[in-house]
Amino acid sequence: WELTILHTNDVHSRLEQTSEDSSKCVNASRCMGGVARLFTKVQQIRRAEPNVLLLDAGDQYQGTIWFTVYKGAEVAHFMNALRYDAMALGNHEFDNGVEGLIEPLLKEAKFPILSANIKAKGPLASQISGLYLPYKVLPVGDEVVGIVGYTSKETPFLSNPGTNLVFEDEITALQPEVDKLKTLNVNKIIALGHSGFEMDKLIAQKVRGVDVVVGGHSNTFLYTGNPPSKEVPAGKYPFIVTSDDGRKVPVVQAYAFGKYLGYLKIEFDERGNVISSHGNPILLNSSIPEDPSIKADINKWRIKLDNYSTQELGKTIVYLDGSSQSCRFRECNMGNLICDAMINNNLRHTDEMFWNHVSMCILNGGGIRSPIDERNNGTITWENLAAVLPFGGTFDLVQLKGSTLKKAFEHSVHRYGQSTGEFLQVGGIHVVYDLSRKPGDRVVKLDVLCTKCRVPSYDPLKMDEVYKVILPNFLANGGDGFQMIKDELLRHDSGDQDINVVSTYISKMKVIYPAVEGRIKFS
């Protein structure tokens, strides 16, 4: 019996087609992805093959103005239109709190939404009961397939699930659910979830009875043969893991942002064992037509976005200096504003010992592309922020050793004075440079804001200590020459859309007046 699994993950609000790098589509003839194009390909495959499941491994939420405006209603609407069969909860599905998940998505989705390792407690337990499930048995042709969901247990550090959801260890939570499916005579089981490729592989290895793992969170690109675009494969598709009980378990992920549609063909024997598996992600490039009916629906929903872009988010009573002349040479108040917003967006008081789990922000000055003038009645709009942060990036959470941070700050000024983009703006950090010293030895003082303290204060950076830092995904990926971050980071979790972070902060503050306050000094 053959099953075709079509899968997406980490779509992050890319409802419209995007450029090849998943930013805003500029030249339509070169654009990719989007739900209208995805629908065309899904329908083609449904037409051609008998037993097809369309699955999503989480993180539909967060990433573009679509989510900012529609807050998840767009996800439910278009996933319903594409007739998804199941979705796993990702960490970003909790970005607007549990209510922001329940109302727009859980109550509106016409497909099951899954996670076996999230347990509700207190008053939420009855409110959310039945709205998401640990597993679902789906009829496919003449057979049944069990789908069991999982979500990163780090979600409380990455999003806003509140205090009434407990995120258990994935493997511990999955095993009893898979065992239950077995007792129900379901012998073909897919683990669908959002914990990253390393955990996906562990689940394949450790959870008895899981036949296939469809994952997300780490934006992993797997491919067999010559890859069709810029993404470099982390391994073959599917990635085969030998389980502890000796089975060959295919593990798949389909990069991110709706650029690819994962296509996995599985052959099962009559006892539900995987005999063979093959496939590849399908690049959704512009040679695949956008479905006109879905496209028309997208255009209808778009109208509200255009209106939103020009509405006031808040006011500034000072000039927001985002000029290259400032932000690539010295501390600039636009850099301070953005870093303060980044930290504010990551306030998660999850432990009595820590006032917060992260206190530091770094931001390449070259990523700040425009100032905002306060003389326009102080008004700040989404459109203004899009000029400051035009690249559609995310502000991510990483873990780095102190020694890596020191290298990053040396790199920040290694060729100072040439208006290059690697000069770092900061938050929760005090740095002093001596430019008379030779490159690689110019950081004379580097103090960082403590987290394990009741009264935050600045302490010298410790080389061997592991620190959490918020930074742009561009830096996490080694951009602007920050190879040491890419090479030495110990953990990387993708965060919220950059503009969304700053706009939320401005809306919350209502009136802002960021200053230049001595975060960066030259001796």
Epitope: T40, R47, P289
Partner: antibody, heavy 121, light 107 residues
Framework: QVQLVQSGAEVKKPGASVKVSCKAS????????LSWVRQATGQGLEWMGE????????YYNEKFKGRVTMTRNTSISTAYMELSSLRSEDTAVYYC??????????????WGAGTTVTVSS | DIVMTQSPDSLAVSLGERATINCKAS??????VAWYQQKPGQPPKLLIY???YRYSGVPDRFSGSGSGTDFTLTISSLQAEDVAVYYC?????????FGGGTKLEIK
């Protein structure tokens, strides 16, 4: 290399049936769609329907519904098109053409050489 | 059914000159349009798929453009071997339909 080899020419009487074969080689037969297209002498191209060998799913042009049957034998990588209740206007060259539904080339990338079917009393 | 209206029915162009063939769909077909070349006694050959993508091995003098309802095949510099009948086809909805063809000759 990819090849679609069709059966030889047929002469049929009105009311009879004809079955044309199309043997595929050089690719995985079950991973592509196969369409049948006909062309009357000096006329344009007319799509009759398609079969997906992997599933056996078929989709026919409404114009031929009830008269056309498309089948396949995956063990010998061959597709068949049977047209019944033949009339003189069915005289045409019948082509099979491959369609890569998993790829992105929206069109028929390989064609058979064609089978001439003549319907005459 | 979606009707594909091709124009002109026939076209005579001097060697080295540009030839342009148009195709109009009766409804929005996005970019799901292919162009074929057919020479006497031969099956059609795929030139352009998805409105503007040149099929592998097709000379770069052939190009396609358009989306929605209006499509164009252009031969930038006509060669003797380009004499043939050219067909457009929509691949958006079944039944997949072809244009009536354009016969291209040398002036």
């Amino acid at each position: 290399q990819v090849q679609l080899v069709q059966s030889g020419a047929e002469v049929k009487k009105p009311g009879a049936s004809v079955k044309v074969s199309c043997k595929a080689s050089g690719y995985t037969f079950t991973s592509y769609g196969l369409s049948w297209v006909r062309q009357a002498t000096g006329q344009g191209l007319e799509w009759m329907g398609e079969i997906y060998p992997g599933s056996g799913n078929t989709y026919y042009n409404e114009k031929f519904k009830g008269r056309v049957t498309m089948t396949r034998n995956t063990s010998i990588s061959t597709a068949y098109m049977e047209l019944s209740s033949l009339r003189s206007e069915d005289t045409a060259v019948y082509y099979c053409a491959r369609y890569d539904y998993l790829g992105s080339s929206y069109g028929f990338d390989y064609w058979g050489a064609g089978t001439t079917v003549t319907v005459s009393s | 059914d979606i009707v594909m209206t091709q124009s002109p029915d026939s076209l005579a162009v001097s060697l080295g000159e540009r030839a342009t063939i148009n195709c109009k769909a009766s409804q929005d077909v996005s970019t799901a349009v292919a162009w074929y070349q057919q020479k006497p006694g031969q099956p059609p050959k795929l030139l352009i798929y998805s409105a503007s993508y040149r099929y592998s091995g097709v000379p770069d003098r052939f190009s396609g453009s358009g989306s929605g309802t209006d499509f164009t095949l252009t031969i930038s510099s006509l060669q003797a071997e380009d004499v043939a009948v050219y067909y457009c086809q929509q691949h958006y909805n079944t039944p997949y339909t072809f244009g009536g063809g354009t016969k291209l000759e040398i002036k």
